[in-house]
C-alpha cells in the first residue's frame, strides 16, 4: 500500500494559558524534500484549516507571521503548538501532510486530536 | 457562494493552441490545491492536471506531459490551463475542480468544451 | 498508477430498489482517500462520498460507502428517480489521481 500514514494523540488537554502541543508523524513512502503541514480543525461536517506551513527535510518549519500555530521537524515527525486558544476551541484537530516535491504526490490525513480547552477562572477580587 | 466558472473552450485545429480560464469564488482560493479534470463525449473522466497553493507546486498526466501547462494567479482567484500542441483525442469537456481540505474533489466548475477538429 | 475498476458497467434497477456499486483497487487504497460522485446528463459530476464512507454536505442518508484495502462499495437504499445517472469512484490519496470508468444506473 502506497498510501501515506498519519498518527497523532487521540487527546490532548490545552494548558490554562491556553496552549496546546502535539506530535504529528507520517510514514513516507517516498523520499521527500518538501511536505506541507496543515492543521485543520474539524466541527460537525464542517473543515478549516486553522494554519499551513511548507518546509524543506532537514530545514525549519515557518507558519506566517500571524499563524496561531508554531512548530519544528525532525525527519518524519513535526511538533505542532497551538496557541491562544479558549474554551470554544475545543476540537477535533486534524494533521494533514503533503509530499509535494519530488513526484509523486502524497496526501495524509490524521485522525484527529481532540483537543479540549478549559478557560482559567477569573481571580477574585482581593481586600486588602 | 463557493463556485468555479470555466471559459476558453472552442473549436480549434490539430497542433494549434488554447488557453482556459476559470474563474474562483466563494472561498480562500491560495489555500486549495484546483485541478483540472476532462470528460471526452461519451467517456469517463480523466485528471488532466493540479496545481498547488502558492502555485509553485504542479503535476501533470503523461498524456498531456510538456504540452499543458497549468498557473494560477491568487491575486485574481483565477487558474489557467495552456494548451498547446492539441490533438484530436484532447477534445473532451474540460472541468476546474477545487480540491477540499480532505482531499476530495469537492466543488466543480459547470466545464468548457474543447473540440480539436481539422 | 493505481487502476481502478468498476462492476457493473451498467445497472437496471426500479425506483424504490437497493442499488450496489462496486470499485476494486489494482493496488490497496487507503480508505481515507477513496470518494465516489455522481453525474447526471450534461451536468459536473458531484461529490457525494469522501474517506470511503464520510457523506459529502447535503448528500441524503440513503446513499452510503463502505469498504477498505482494494475492494470498496457504494450503497444505494432506495433508489430515488433523481438517482438515476453514472457514478464515479476516485482515489485521491497519491498522484496520479484516477478514476474508476463508471457504473450507469438505469431505469429498469
Known amino acids: 500500500c502506497k498510501a501515506m500514514h498519519v498518527a497523532q494523540p487521540a487527546v490532548v488537554l490545552a494548558s490554562s494559558r491556553g496552549i496546546a502541543s502535539f506530535v504529528c508523524e507520517y510514514a513516507s513512502p517516498g523520499k521527500a524534500t518538501e511536505v506541507r503541514v496543515t492543521v485543520l480543525r474539524q466541527a460537525d461536517s464542517q473543515v478549516t484549516e486553522v494554519c499551513a506551513a511548507t518546509y524543506m527535510m532537514g530545514n525549519e518549519l515557518t507558519f506566517l507571521d500571524d499563524s496561531i500555530c508554531t512548530g519544528t521537524s525532525s525527519g518524519n515527525q513535526v511538533n505542532l503548538t497551538i496557541q491562544g486558544l479558549r474554551a470554544m476551541d475545543t476540537g477535533l484537530y486534524i494533521c494533514k501532510v503533503e509530499l509535494m516535491y519530488p513526484p509523486p504526490y502524497y496526501l495524509g490525513i490524521g485522525n484527529g486530536t481532540q483537543i479540549y480547552v478549559i478557560d482559567p477562572e477569573p481571580c477574585p477580587d482581593s481586600d486588602f | 457562494q463557493v463556485q468555479l466558472v470555466e471559459s476558453g473552450g472552442g473549436v480549434v485545429q490539430p497542433g494549434r493552441s488554447l488557453r482556459l480560464s476559470c474563474a474562483a469564488s466563494?472561498?480562500?482560493?491560495?489555500?486549495?490545491?484546483v485541478h483540472w479534470v476532462r470528460q471526452a463525449p461519451g467517456k469517463g473522466l480523466e485528471w488532466v492536471a493540479v496545481?498547488?497553493?502558492?502555485?509553485?507546486?504542479?503535476f501533470y498526466a503523461d498524456s498531456v506531459k510538456g504540452r499543458f501547462t497549468i498557473s494560477r494567479d491568487n491575486s485574481k482567484n483565477t487558474l489557467f490551463l495552456q494548451m498547446n500542441s492539441l490533438r484530436a483525442e484532447d477534445t473532451a469537456v474540460y472541468y476546474c475542480?477545487?480540491?477540499?481540505?480532505?482531499?476530495?474533489?469537492?466543488?466543480w466548475g459547470q466545464g468548457t468544451m474543447v473540440t480539436v477538429s481539422s | 498508477e493505481i487502476v481502478l475498476t468498476q462492476s457493473p458497467g451498467t445497472l437496471s434497477l426500479s425506483p424504490g430498489e437497493r442499488a450496489t456499486l462496486s470499485c476494486r483497487a489494482s493496488?490497496?487504497?487507503?480508505?481515507?482517500?477513496l470518494a465516489w460522485y455522481q453525474q447526471k446528463p450534461g451536468q459536473a459530476p458531484r461529490l457525494l462520498i469522501y474517506?470511503?464512507?464520510s457523506r459529502a454536505t447535503g448528500i441524503p442518508d440513503r446513499f452510503s460507502g463502505s469498504g477498505s484495502g482494494t475492494d470498496f462499495t457504494l450503497t444505494i437504499s432506495r433508489l430515488e428517480p433523481e438517482d438515476f445517472a453514472v457514478y464515479y469512484c476516485?482515489?485521491?490519496?497519491?498522484?496520479?489521481?484516477?478514476f474508476g470508468q463508471g457504473t450507469k444506473v438505469e431505469i429498469k
Open positions: 493496488q490497496s487504497v487507503s480508505s481515507s482517500y
Open positions: 466563494g472561498f480562500t482560493f491560495n489555500s486549495y490545491g
Open positions: 475542480v477545487r480540491a477540499g481540505y480532505l482531499g476530495a474533489f469537492d466543488i
Open positions: 476516485q482515489q485521491y490519496g497519491s498522484s496520479p489521481w484516477t
Open positions: 496545481i498547488w497553493y502558492e502555485g509553485s507546486n504542479k
Open positions: 474517506g470511503a464512507s
